[in-house]
């Protein structure tokens, strides 16, 4: 039950990261335009990963895209890939995650493979959450630096008799929601993977069964046991771990994998 | 069809207070800003202020202490009041709605306010 | 605040001759978001409210003819005329509309010969 549990959860919250992954990438407002220690302009400056916008304090507001590829900053394309391979690995994540959920049957798939298949997903959500908080760093780093640059511009570049508005960009909505986004995912990513570990199905222990060969005695003991010499030692089957099997010492009506819709 | 009116007292004496209402049709004072102009007798424009769609408000700064630009509750009317009025105060009062680059596309035909004792 | 200056003060000119006045604004009208240039040319006829001419600079308004013609970036700006009609004889002004206080140039008064 507390496998399930976990492994819903997990789904449930690396859905929700990986949709504010997707939103953080269509928002445009990775970087917004400064308003502190600024004039106050009747025109509000933000971009994001695909197009700029201006709005107007009379409510107009104009988005161009960039219709360049070659003409932009490596470290925008390096963000925009980041961004959509995590979205990328997140979608096929959620795909396999959906299938590996331990309340939906598909045919006779085995525990095993429902494990595999958790696994997996979880590793593509931590990857995908990884890929959306390293993008989002990257432009928050980039931002800081331009910042700083043009800080630096603001009191050294007054020389002339013309004064030029100075446009300083800080972090906008999108940042703080790729963060949050990248986070969960990553969480929702350690739960399936958590999940996984109580999905494995433990290995099948049987009745010991002693072969007795002449000079000296061996008993083998199949079922992942350690064969032990003599017969004193382990005579008695032993479970490697408590994960919900029984011996046969403990036979008692015990729910089979098919009874669960 | 947009169509802004101003109305005013039309005399006012010195040190007392104004306020002029604009009243619109045609558009929603919750999608476009408005803003107030004055020009006095045979001289240039001044800008004075604007309320925006959303409410806030910008002003000319030398007369920020005396103005105050606000709109009704059933978004029709925008009112300017100003404060210790003085000579030089007598004007031409002018609303005009905001469009694109902020500019003042369609203006009232004014209302004049003569400040003397 | 920003001072726009706009020269000449008044102009006097024959009908079907082309003109050209100017504006400058003590700071730069360019805004770096959008490469678009915050400056308005309206004109005053007698006895009239003004009327938008031209906004951003260059785009001229809805049911303006097109011998109006603004250009100019940053700092530096222009209305032309290119063949002056009796219609046309009011003051021109110009305003920033880019960094508050919006304000107004002195404006141009064109006269006809």
């Known amino acids: 039950m507390a496998v399930t549990a976990c492994q819903g959860l997990g789904f449930v919250v690396s859905l929700i990261g990986i949709a504010g992954i997707i939103a953080a990438t269509c928002m445009d407002q990775w970087s917004t335009q400064d308003l502190y220690n600024n004039p106050v302009t009747a025109v509000f400056n933000y971009q994001g990963l695909w197009r700029s916008c201006v709005r107007e304090s009379s409510g107009f507001t104009e988005c161009r895209g960039y219709f360049t590829l070659l003409g932009l900053p490596a470290m925008l394309q390096a963000v925009r890939a980041l961004m959509i391979v995590g979205i990328v690995l997140g979608a096929i994540g959620l795909l396999v995650s959906i299938f590996a959920l331990k309340c939906i049957r598909i045919g006779s798939m085995e525990d095993s493979a429902k494990a595999n298949m958790t696994l997996t997903s979880g590793i593509m959500f931590i990857v995908s959450g990884l890929c959306a908080i390293a993008g989002v760093s990257v432009f928050a780093n980039m931002l800081v630096t331009n910042f700083w640059m043009s800080t630096a511009n603001m009191y050294t570049g007054m020389g002339g008799m013309v004064q030029t508005v100075q446009t300083r960009y800080t972090f906008g909505a999108a940042l703080f929601v790729g963060w949050v986004a990248g986070g969960l995912t990553l969480i929702g990513g350690v739960m399936m993977c958590i999940a996984c570990r109580g999905l494995a199905p433990e290995e099948t222990n049987y009745k010991a069964v002693s072969y007795h060969a002449s000079g000296h005695s061996v008993a083998y003991k199949p079922g992942g046991f350690k064969a032990s010499t003599g017969f004193g030692s382990n005579t008695k089957n032993k479970k490697i771990y408590d994960g919900g099997a029984r011996t046969e010492d403990e036979v008692q009506s015990y729910p089979s994998k098919h009874d669960y819709v | 069809q947009v169509q802004l009116k101003e109305s005013g007292p039309g005399q006012v004496a010195p040190s007392q207070s104004l306020s002029i209402a604009c009243t619109v049709s045609?558009?929603?004072?919750?999608?476009?800003?408005v803003h107030w102009v004055r020009q006095p007798p045979g001289k240039g424009l001044e800008w004075l202020g604007v309320?925006?769609?959303?409410?806030?408000?910008n002003y000319d700064s030398a007369l920020m202490s005396r103005l105050t630009i606000s709109k009704d509750n059933s978004r029709t009317r925008v009112f300017l009041k100003m404060n210790s009025l003085q000579t030089d105060d007598t004007a031409i009062y002018y609303c005009?709605?905001?469009?694109?680059?902020?500019?003042?596309?369609?203006w009232g035909p004014g209302t004049t306010l003569t400040v003397s004792s | 605040d920003i001072v726009m200056t706009q020269s000449p003060s008044s102009l006097t000119v024959t009908a079907g001759e082309k003109v050209t006045m100017s504006c400058k604004s003590s700071?730069?009208?360019?805004?770096?978001?959008?490469?678009?240039?915050?400056l308005t040319w309206y004109q005053q006829k007698p006895g009239q409210p003004p009327r938008l001419l031209i906004y951003?600079?260059?785009t001229r308004d809805s049911g303006v003819p097109d011998r109006f013609t603004g250009s100019g970036s940053r700092t530096d700006f222009t209305l032309t005329i290119s063949s002056v009609q009796a219609e046309d004889l009011a003051v021109y002004y110009c305003?920033?509309?880019?960094?508050?206080?919006?304000?107004f140039g002195a404006g141009t008064k064109l006269e006809l010969k």
């Open positions: 305003q920033n509309n880019f960094i508050y206080p919006l304000t």
């Open positions: 700071q730069s009208l360019l805004n770096s978001g959008n490469q678009r240039n915050y």
């Open positions: 045609g558009f929603s004072l919750s999608s476009y800003g």
């Open positions: 309320i925006w769609a959303g409410g806030s408000t």
């Open positions: 951003w600079s260059s």
């Open positions: 005009a709605r905001s469009l694109y680059g902020n500019s003042l596309d369609s």
